[in-house]
C-alpha cells in the first residue's frame, strides 16, 4: 500500500524558520502535492502550498519556499514572523494525488521535546482515501 | 469546464479606484487558485499576483504592491482585484486565471481618462 | 526578478513552412530535486485571452495540436511549430513557472504570408 511520510523540522539557526519534508512511498506518478496547516485538506486545513511536478511549485504566507526534493519528495520553507512560535504546536498535512492511486495523505508535527535541528520521526498518521 | 466570466469594461478618472471582479464556475471554488495579469495596449503580459481562496492568503509582484489589491469572496464564488490612484499607465486589459494559468477569463479593459 | 528574452520579435512564414522560436532566461528554470523545467509557452490570438500550449518545457497541453513541439532546458528554450497553418497567427510568448514574480517575455508575432 502507498505511504505519505512527513516531518517536521526546526532549524537550528533560526528558531523561528521550520522546514516541513513529505513524501510518497509507493507505486505511480504523482499529479499534485497539497501542503496544509492546522488539520489535513478540505477539512480544516489551511491551504500552504501546491507543487506540481510540471506546472511549477505555488505557496502562500508563512510558507517561503515549496520545492522538489525528489520526484517523490518535496519541502516546505516556513517563516513564523510572530514573537511566539506557533509552529511548534501545529500539525502539517501533505496529500499526494498519484495515478492511478487516487489520494494519499498524512499529517505531522514538531514534537514537544525537540531540540532546534533535530526533526520529527517518520511516524505518518495516515488518512488513506481513493478520491 | 473550468469557466472564469469577468466584470465588463471600465473608464475611470485619474486618481480614482476601481474594483475588477472574476467569477469561476465548473468546479468547487475552493479549488480556484486565482492569478492576475496586466496586458497594457499591444504589449506583454505582466504578472500581478495571486490569492489562495480558502484563507486570501495572496502573493504580490513587488511592482503591483500599493497598487493592487486582491480578495476573494467564497459566497459568491468570485475573486476581485482593486487598483487605486490610478493613473493612464493603469490603462490595460487586465485578466484572471486559474492557477497555472491553464484556464483564463475573456479580460475586462480599464480605461483611465479625465 | 527572472529576465525572459524572447527572439525573433516577429517572423512571417507561408503556410506548412517549419517556425522555430527562442526564449532565453536570465536564471536557470531546472528543479535539480526532479529535474523538471518550470517553462510555459502561451499562444494569444488577436482579441482573445492567452491559452496555455505547453508547460513544463515539452509537454503539450491536452488538446494542443501535435504540430507544436516544446524543448530545451536550464536556460535556453524553443517552441517549434512543424507545419504552420493558418490559425496559427497569433503571438507566443514564453513564462516563468519557476519562481516568485511569475515573468513574461515579450513574445513573438507570427504572421502568415
Known amino acids: 500500500t502507498p505511504e505519505v511520510w512527513v516531518q517536521v523540522q526546526m532549524e537550528a539557526t533560526e528558531l523561528s524558520s521550520f522546514t516541513v519534508h513529505c513524501g510518497f512511498l509507493g507505486p505511480g506518478s504523482i499529479s499534485l502535492v497539497t501542503v496544509s496547516w492546522g488539520g489535513p485538506d478540505g477539512a480544516g486545513g489551511t491551504k500552504l502550498a501546491v507543487l506540481h511536478p510540471e506546472l511549477g511549485t505555488r505557496q502562500w504566507a508563512p510558507a517561503r519556499q515549496a520545492r522538489w526534493e525528489t520526484q517523490s519528495s518535496i519541502s516546505l520553507a516556513l517563516e513564523d514572523s510572530g514573537a511566539s512560535s506557533p509552529f511548534a504546536n501545529t500539525t502539517f498535512c501533505c496529500k499526494f494525488a498519484s495515478f492511478p492511486e487516487g489520494s494519499w495523505e498524512s499529517c505531522g508535527s514538531l514534537p514537544p521535546s525537540s531540540d532546534p535541528g533535530l526533526s520529527a520521526p517518520p511516524t505518518p498518521v495516515p488518512i488513506l482515501r481513493a478520491d | 469546464e473550468v469557466q472564469l466570466q469577468q466584470s465588463g469594461p471600465e473608464l475611470v478618472k485619474p486618481g480614482a479606484s476601481v474594483k475588477i471582479s472574476c467569477k469561476a464556475s465548473?468546479?468547487?471554488?475552493?479549488?480556484?487558485?486565482i492569478n492576475w495579469v496586466k496586458q497594457s495596449h499591444g504589449k506583454s503580459l505582466e504578472w500581478i499576483g495571486d490569492i489562495e481562496p480558502n484563507n486570501g492568503g495572496t502573493n504580490y509582484n513587488q511592482k503591483f504592491k500599493g497598487k493592487a489589491t486582491l480578495t476573494v469572496d467564497k459566497s459568491s464564488s468570485t475573486a476581485y482585484m482593486e487598483l487605486r490612484s490610478l493613473t493612464s499607465e493603469d490603462s490595460a486589459i487586465y485578466y484572471c486565471a486559474t492557477l497555472y494559468f491553464d484556464y483564463w477569463g475573456q479580460g475586462t479593459t480599464l480605461t483611465v481618462s479625465s | 526578478d527572472i529576465v525572459m528574452t524572447q527572439s525573433p520579435s516577429s517572423l512571417s512564414v507561408s503556410a506548412g513552412e517549419k517556425v522555430t522560436m527562442s526564449c532565453k532566461s536570465s536564471q536557470s528554470l531546472l528543479n535539480s530535486g526532479n529535474q523538471k523545467n518550470y517553462l510555459a509557452w502561451y499562444q494569444q490570438k488577436p482579441g482573445q485571452p492567452p491559452k496555455l500550449l505547453i508547460y513544463g518545457a515539452s509537454t503539450r497541453e491536452s488538446g494542443v495540436p501535435d504540430r507544436f513541439t516544446g524543448s530545451g532546458s536550464g536556460t535556453d528554450f524553443t517552441l517549434t511549430i512543424s507545419s504552420v497553418q493558418a490559425e496559427d497567427l497569433a503571438v507566443y510568448y514564453c513564462q516563468n513557472d519557476h519562481s516568485y514574480p511569475f515573468t513574461f517575455g515579450s513574445g513573438t508575432k507570427l504572421e502568415i504570408k
Open positions: 465548473g468546479n468547487t471554488f475552493t479549488d480556484y487558485y
